[in-house]
Every structure is written in C-alpha cells, then in structure tokens.
Interface confidence: medium
C-alpha cells in the first residue's frame, strides 16, 4: 500500500492548556483555562496531547532561548541556538570509541526503511524498560514491541520525522553510538525527497540510561513548518500508546488488536533551528512503585492505583493496559485500602481471559507481528477526522478515544 | 492458499541468459518485499537479491552484481529475475522468497517468512 | 561482510533427546537473526526471527535465543520430523547472509 496523497495532514491544535514552566528571567501563568490562551503575543511551542496546547511566552527580543514546559510524562527545555547548552548537549559521534559507532548500511542507502537495532541498557520510555527500537531513515525511532504498518503514527521518538532519503546521496548516513549509559541516532547529511536543492539536514536523537530524550540539530537548511506532509508525516516529539484486545464482531472466538494513543508531545515545528536543542527529562510515573503503600501514597499528577493479583502501580494507562483490564485491576482498586490485600495470595488470580498479548506466539499472516491482524484493506484508510496516521489527536490520559484499527 | 511460485528455470551456457518469474498469490503482493536466494547443488543457502515492496529500493549480493536485474510486476503479482552473462557457478536452486516487512510509510527487511519450491538453474557448456 | 559461522556441522542425536545448535556472527547483528529448517528436496521453512520469535505453527519445542553475535536454537525433545539442516541468517546489514547450515541427524 503506497502512501496516499494527504496522509500526512499536520494535526490541528488540541484543546490547550498552558502548562508549568518558566522562560528565563520571565514568569509564566501556570495554567490558563481549557482551550483558552489569553494573550495574543504569546507563541505555541508545542502540544501535549495529554493535556492540550502549551503556550510559552517570548522574551523581549522575540529570540526564545530557553524554554520549559511540563507535560505529565517529561518535562521539556528548548534551548535556542544563542544557548550555549544547546551546543552541550550535540554528542560528537565522530570523536566517540570507534567500536562503539556503527554505521547503518541498509539505513544509510535507502529510502523508507527501518531497521530493528538492541540496546546495550533497559532505556525507560513513558516509565516502560525497552531494549529493542526500531530505527527509521525518516528522522525518527519506533518505539513500539509490536510491528505494524503505520509506524509513523505513534510510539515514536522523533527530532525530525520527515520524508528523508539517505539514498539520494553518498554522503548521507544514519549512524548510532552506544556507549551504554547513552544510545545515540545521527541522521547525517539527509535530503528530503523531492527538496534535495534545499540542502542536508543533520540531526540526532540520544535516549539516556535514566530516561532523558535529546534532540539536537546540527544543521537545518530550511524552515520546518514549509517541509511538506503530502508524502510522508511531520513531527518532532514523542508518542506513547497501548494496544488492547477486543472480540471481533465477525469472528467470535478471536480477538482484535487496536492501539490507543494515550500521550503525545509535539514540538512547535518552528523552533527546529540548526543548533538548537531540546532535552525532555522524564517525570516520575506510577510504573515506578513497586509497593502498595508507595503507590497509595504518591503524589503524582496520575490517579495511580495498585494492582494486589498484577503487583503492579499504574494509572491504569500504560503499555500493560491489556493485563490490567484482563486480570479486573480497575474493579479490584476501587475502594480498597493496601492492608485490605494482606491476607490475599497474589499468585492465585488468573486473568479474564486465556489470551495473552505479549506471547511469542501470536497468530498472524506473517511471522511480522501486525496490530489488527482480521482488519480488511479498508480498514486502512485513514479517517478524515484525525492526524495524518489515522490516530486522533485528541487522546488523553482521563480520555478514552476511538482507536486506530491497522491492517496486516 | 499463501504461495509463490517459481518458473523459468533450465539449461542455459556460459554467458547466456534467462529470466525466472515468481507468482504470488494468497497475499497483498505489494505489501512485501521480495528476494530471490540460491542453493548450489549439495551447498548451503545464499541470498542473491531484493526488491522493495513499490520497487524503489533494489539490493544485490556482489557475486551478481551488474549481471542480475530484480524487478515485479504489482499488478500481476509476479517477480522476476533477469540474469545475463551467466557462469557455471551460478548453477543452483533458485527459490524467490517473501521478506516479512511492513509496509505503508517503511519497510522493514526481517526473516524471509514464505518461500516458493525453488526452480533449476544449470549454467553448462 | 558478515559472516555466520554455525557448529557443530553435524550433530547426532536420538530422537526425543534435545539438541543445542549454535550460530555465531562476526560482528554483532542485534537481535536480527533467523533460524530456518530445510528437509532434502524442499525449500527452507522459517522457524525463528527476531532471535527468539517463534514463526506462525511452528511448534514449541522449538527455541530461539541470543543478541549481538552468539545464537541458539534449541529443540527440547527431538521428533522423527525435526531430523533436518538448520540454518541461521542475519538480516541487521547488506549483504543478507547465512550461516553455512548444522545438519541433525538420526544418532
């Protein structure tokens, strides 16, 4: 199925709250009314899904230099080009241990491909350990455990996701590093298919052992926003989503895998400048509990509950969300206090169904693993009322929406 | 019923050419890359060639390079290999098989998931 | 070039026995590694990807494991159909190779 002209549509705004965060030597109103922002100078640096619209204010001199924005899940800094920070945070591959650099052949000569590389270290995304990504030459990283077709649409980590081919030049090349407490992405020298006169872009993505996402830009030739999304999406900035099973109509005794968005970040496409640099360091999430009492007890912005059968904290909204609802955690929550699960054997529950997701097993058409393996090629048409990969762009954590059914 | 099949191959001489097809059916043929890979007689398996799902992308191992074209054919569900200035040491089974990939935005070359039952090639004087 | 480099290059087994065949690559390739099984006069059939994903029907005795540049297949308890050649593949960098095959056979 070869893309469709339109199926990268820029999504339109959410509805928008101003977040926690300050701009250097300048204050900023902690939260604005829903779906208002009141003054009109103020500029959008970038969206959360989770939340809606984040707005930022400018400095005098209408240069933004540094930037920071809460979105539930990490907490974002911009750093303009006139930052000295930004420069900080560009890891110089070429001056890293040589054996601990690899350039990606199959990546660096082809247009539209991905490929699936092992981590040396668990890199936490949305609070879920990971040790395998999936490396694409547009410019971002699939994050996804579970393959499927329309990898741009979510569970991604993107500087830049754009229609980029390495195979237009020789002097293109995706490269990663890892040393083991960073993994770095360069796409270096890439040309955007069909603007190649506009000049390379060269950029990285690092994810952290604790957590921590940079995106930093070396060179970016032309202004963003003028990048096309006819051929292929444009995003800069994380998604996460979970994927859950539910009986099909049509044949009863299976099941059907559909994939919930349940955060997004985008970044104000704008502020992608050569040097400038964005770093999102990860905000503590219900995951992390890993007692009752400390569940209980937390204080995050998350509504966490514990789940005594599972042993697990969670908001209920997390890649585990297909276990949390098959082994009842949502009924088995309400109401009940930690010493109310003390005489109770955790190991003696078994889940409502005898389905599990996360099997090696999983029949499908192909040994790939694809989202909604009985889904007909219609259900790949992407629905007029969403972003630009069929996945609504209004999903929150306290909001469930229609999910994306992807075909084999 | 999901399968390929090969035809086209046969007796050939040194520096002679041929053309294999390979018919797909059961499956959305232009979702998949495809690749071709050969077996000496009484040898161990080698990858020859690839081909993306639109065609755009074309890869070749460099014992064939310059001499062998891939190429399909979306609307017919076939693949093809052109192979010219043929050698003796080209002899062998030549099995077209289907990459597990996914398709839409990218492609993702992993194990080669359907394979057809192969089809002769002997390069012989 | 990567090269794949599988032992033993026969292995004997009684049926019912396990049967532990190794695949090493000379650089690492991740965890994007095949295992195939090839009977005489047929074509190859996929049993494992991604190093540790079994393919679609097949059984469960058959295992995968391993990341970077050694890998296992495994077969726990060896059936009378499962005497064959078994290759293993990278598929992480250009050219794709394959490892030059273990055959099992009848101890």
């Known amino acids: 199925l070869s893309p469709q002209p339109g199926a990268g549509h820029d999504e339109g705004p959410g509805s928008g709250w101003a977040a926690k965060g300050t701009v250097r030597g300048w204050n900023r109103r902690a939260r604005e009314s829903p779906g208002h922002v009141s003054e009109p100078d103020r500029t959008q640096l970038s969206q959360d899904l989770g939340g809606g619209t984040l707005a930022m204010d400018t400095l005098p001199d209408n240069r933004t230099r540094v930037v920071e924005d809460n979105h539930s899940y990490y907490v974002s800094r911009l750093y303009g080009p006139s930052e000295p920070h930004s420069r900080e945070l560009w890891v110089d591959v070429a001056e890293a241990n040589r054996s601990q650099v690899k350039i990606h052949t199959i990546l660096s000569n082809t247009h539209r491909q991905a490929s699936r590389v092992v981590l040396s270290f668990d890199f936490p995304f949305y609070g879920h350990p990971l040790r395998q990504i999936t490396i694409a030459t547009g410019g971002f990283i699939f994050m996804g455990d579970v393959i499927h077709r329309m990898l741009t649409a979510t569970q991604y980590v993107a500087p830049l996701m754009a229609n980029f081919n390495p195979g237009y030049s020789d002097n293109s090349t995706v490269v990663y590093f890892d040393n083991g407490t960073v993994f770095v992405v360069q796409w270096d020298h890439v040309y955007l298919q069909g603007w190649e006169d506009k000049g390379s872009f060269t950029f990285q993505a690092a994810l952290h052992h604790d957590g921590r996402i940079v995106f930093a830009y070396k060179e970016i030739p032309m202004s963003v926003p003028e990048i096309s999304s006819s051929q292929h999406p444009v995003k800069t900035g994380l998604s996460d989503a979970f994927m859950i099973l539910n009986p099909s109509p049509d044949v009863p005794e299976s099941r059907r895998r559909s994939i919930f968005e349940y955060h997004r970040i985008e970044l104000d496409p704008s502020k992608v400048t050569s040097m400038s640099a964005v770093e999102f360091t990860p905000l503590p999430t219900c995951l992390q509990h890993r007692s009752c009492d400390a569940c209980m007890s937390s204080d995050l912005t998350f509504n966490c509950s514990w789940c005594h059968v599972l042993q697990r904290c969670s908001s209920g909204f997390d890649r585990y969300r297909q276990e949390w609802m098959d082994y009842g955690c949502a009924q088995e929550a309400e109401g009940r206090m930690c010493e109310d699960f003390q005489d109770e054997d955790h190991d003696s529950a078994s889940p409502d169904t005898s389905f599990s997701p996360y099997d090696g097993d999983l029949t499908t058409t192909s040994s790939s693993l694809f989202i909604d393996s009985l889904t007909t090629e219609d259900d790949t048409k992407l629905n007029p009322y969403a972003g630009g990969d069929g996945l609504q762009n209004n999903l929150s954590p306290k909001t469930k929406g229609t999910p994306v059914h992807l075909g084999t | 019923e999901v399968q390929l099949l090969e035809s086209g191959g046969g007796l050939v001489q040194p520096g002679g050419s041929l053309r294999l097809s390979c018919a797909a059916s059961g499956f959305t043929f232009s979702r998949y890359a495809m690749s071709w890979v050969r077996q000496a007689p009484g040898k161990g398996l080698e990858w020859v060639s690839i081909?993306?799902?639109?065609?755009?992308?074309?890869y070749y191992a460099d014992s064939v390079k310059g001499r062998f074209t891939i190429s399909r054919d979306n609307s017919k569900n076939t693949l093809y290999l052109q192979m010219n200035s043929l050698r003796a040491e080209d002899t062998a089974v030549y099995y077209c098989?289907?990459?597990?990939?996914?398709?839409?935005?990218?492609?993702?070359?992993?194990?080669?998931?359907?394979w057809g039952q192969g089809t002769l090639v002997t390069v012989s004087s | 070039e990567i090269v794949m480099t599988q032992s033993p290059a026969t292995l004997s087994v009684s049926p019912g026995e396990r049967a532990t065949l190794s695949c090493r690559a000379s650089q690492s390739v991740g965890g994007n590694l095949a295992w195939y099984q090839q009977k005489p006069g047929q074509a190859p059939r996929l049993l494992i990807y991604d190093a540790s994903t079994r393919a679609t029907g097949i059984p469960a005795r058959f295992s995968g494991s391993g990341s970077g540049t050694e890998f296992t297949l495994t077969i726990s308890s060896l059936q009378s159909e499962d005497f064959a050649v078994y290759y293993c593949q990278q598929y992480n960098d250009w050219p794709l190779t394959f490892g030059q095959g273990t055959k099992v056979e009848i101890k």
């Open positions: 098989a289907r990459i597990d990939t996914f398709a839409y935005y990218y492609s993702l070359y992993r194990a080669f998931d359907l």
């Open positions: 081909i993306s799902g639109t065609g755009g992308n074309t």
